[in-house]
Structure formats: C-alpha cells, structure tokens
C-alpha cells in the first residue's frame, strides 16, 4: 500500500478553515491518520484526524480559529503532513508546503433568496461567506437553473466574471417551479477551484394574466 | 516550458562524495517539489530523494537514507544532492525531476507523478 496510488489534496477557504483528502489504494479502512498542520511564520501548530469517506479516502478539516478570522495571509505557507499510526509509531505518509492562496476553494454561498419575481423573469441574490477581505472585489460566479424536466448537468452555466452577488433571470416560463444554485471562485490562485454549489433555492414565477377574452 | 539542467556528475572513489545540481528555467509553479532519480545500465529509474517547495519536507529512498542529502534554494532556481559514503551500486545516471502538485511521500515516489526531467548526469562510483 505505501508504494500505490495515493492523493493528498488540500484547499484554503480564505478564513480559517484548510480541508483535506488523503487516498491511497490498499490501504486499511480502519488505519489511523491524521494531518498535522505546521506554517512557517505562526506560533499555532494544528491537526486533524482524518475520516473515511469512501473505501480508500479520508478528509478532515483543520480549523485554525473563528470562522471569519483572517488565520493566514499571502505569504504564509503552511507545511501539510499526513501522519498513519503503524504499530507504535506514526508515519509520514505524504508531505506537502502548502500556500494557502493558491490553493483556495471558498464556502458555497449562503442567504439565497428571491428579491422579486415575474412571470417570465426572477431577480436573486445570495451572499458569500466567510470569504477573506484580500479579495476585494476579485471574485466571480456561477450560476444555474434547474427547469422541469431536466437535471442539473444538463443546466446551461451562467458566468458573472465579476463580484456580483445577485442575478435577473429571465425567459423563464410562467407558472412554473425552479430551482437555482451559485458556486463561487476567487480569480486569484494556481490550483484554486470552484466552492461548492449553494443549497438549491426553489422558486415559482408567477401565472400569466388572464386575457380579457377568456 | 520547464528545462531542467543536471551537473556535478562524475568519477569518484568508493567512500567518496558528490555534489548534483539541478538548475530550473522556464515556467514557474508556485509550490513545486523536485526530486532526484537514478537509472543505472539495464535497470529501472529509481527514486532517490524528494523536497518540498520551501524545503520543509524531504523524503529518501532507504537505499540513500543517512548518506544523501537533498536541499534546494529557490532564489537561485536551484536543487541540489549532496551524496557521501558513496558505493560502486549508487552508479547510475542521475536525474532531476519537477511535480507541480508539491506533494511528496512514500506513495508519491513513482516516476509518473513527475511531468518534467532533465538529460541526466552520470554518476560513476568506482571501487
């Protein structure tokens, strides 16, 4: 098992808040590990114990403090062990210095709601959470909609290249339930990736007006 | 594009020490790890010792443990190997090697998990 296939995969969430994965093919459901976070420049040393997830895949999170204090900045780097009990002692299994801002992946965004909504259109906006001040404005979105009949795959993704936490959307159908979900990504960092999508927020446009006729 | 360039190889005597250097250039990735392997005549390419990016981790073959050191220092794009107590079975060309990913550990040791090599420098240990 030492020698097959292992990942270690780590993400910031700009806050205080670094969540792991470590997988490594024919290891033992019941092994022991934990990650052990060690920064270069803070008098903090943290660890967690990882948990499986799946036959052979762990996670944990390391909180590092409340979670929207600003734990770690551009220049820190933070060395990442993953430590496995064999026998009495604890081995290091894969070992990583780890710069949190370029490896970000942000909380999904929160307080989705509906802000006014028509027969063919509905105005949204959502908040983002526990996303770090050095963002400023730095930031984009995406955004689906789930129509009857279809899945979330097969949505069409609408891009926001700019830090806009609301979204019109329009030539929806009248009379008709949605759905609707946004992930967030800094534009700042080499393996930064997409948050989570957000809860689904369901929503009904409103019927057509009757005519006059009818 | 990445080039990484090996010297420092040559002839020396059993119990004798070398110093490798691996020169980088090229694309920069912002927490690489960098490794040596060795290739000798009608053998496999062998792992021989890893570092992390800011040089806070290291990982060894058993085979070099105790006698091969690994540094690098990242203002000068520069990984080094210093080899002491050297054997006639540490003969080989020796290679530097760059995984963007920055991870590095028992299970991250194969070959594939690193994208760019260097040409090699040969590693001559005589008894």
């Known amino acids: 098992a030492v020698n097959g296939t292992s990942q270690f995969t780590c993400f910031y969430n700009s806050r205080a808040n670094i969540s792991c994965v470590w997988s490594q093919d024919g290891a033992l459901q019941d092994t022991s590990c934990q990650v052990h976070a060690w920064p270069d420049r803070r008098r903090w040393n943290q660890t967690c114990e990882l948990l499986p997830v799946s036959q052979a895949s762990w996670a944990c999170n390391l909180i590092l403090g409340a979670p929207d204090s600003q734990k770690l900045t551009t220049v820190d780097i933070v060395t990442l062990r993953v430590l496995c009990r064999e026998g009495v002692r604890w081995r290091v299994m894969a070992i990583q210095d780890f710069k949190p801002f370029e490896n970000l992946r942000l909380m999904a965004p929160i307080s989705l709601q509906v802000v006014h909504v028509e027969t063919h259109r509905c105005n949204i906006s959502w908040e983002i959470s526990q996303a770090s001040h050095y963002f400023e404005r730095h930031l984009e979105f995406e955004a689906r909609t789930l129509s009857p009949g279809h899945t979330w795959e097969e949505a069409p993704l609408l891009t926001l290249k700019q830090k806009q936490e609301w979204i019109c959307l329009e030539t929806l159908t009248p009379d008709t339930q949605y759905e609707f979900q946004v992930r967030v990504k800094p534009l700042q960092g080499e393996f930064t990736t997409w948050s989570p999508w957000s809860q689904p927020l369901a929503f009904r446009t409103k019927p057509a007006a009757l005519g006059k006729d009818t | 594009e990445v080039q990484l360039v090996e010297s420092g190889g040559g002839l020396v005597q059993a119990g004798g020490s070398l110093r490798l250097s691996c020169a980088a250039s090229?694309?920069?990735?912002?927490?690489?790890?960098k490794a040596w392997f060795r290739q000798a005549p009608g053998k496999e390419r062998e792992f021989v010792a890893a570092?992390?990016?800011?040089?806070?981790?290291?990982d060894y073959a058993d085979s070099v443990k105790d006698r091969f050191t690994i540094t690098r220092d990242n203002a000068k794009n520069m990984v080094y190997l210093q080899m002491s107590s050297l054997k006639p079975e540490d003969t080989a060309v020796y290679y530097c090697?760059?995984?963007?990913?920055?991870?590095?550990?028992?299970?991250?040791?194969?070959?594939?998990?690193?994208?760019?090599w260097g040409q090699g420098t040969q590693v001559t240990v005589a008894s």
């Open positions: 090697a760059l995984n963007p990913t920055g991870v590095i550990g028992p299970g991250f040791r194969n070959s594939n998990r690193y994208d760019y």
């Open positions: 090229g694309r920069t990735f912002s927490s690489d790890a």
């Open positions: 570092i992390t990016w800011a040089g806070r981790g290291t």
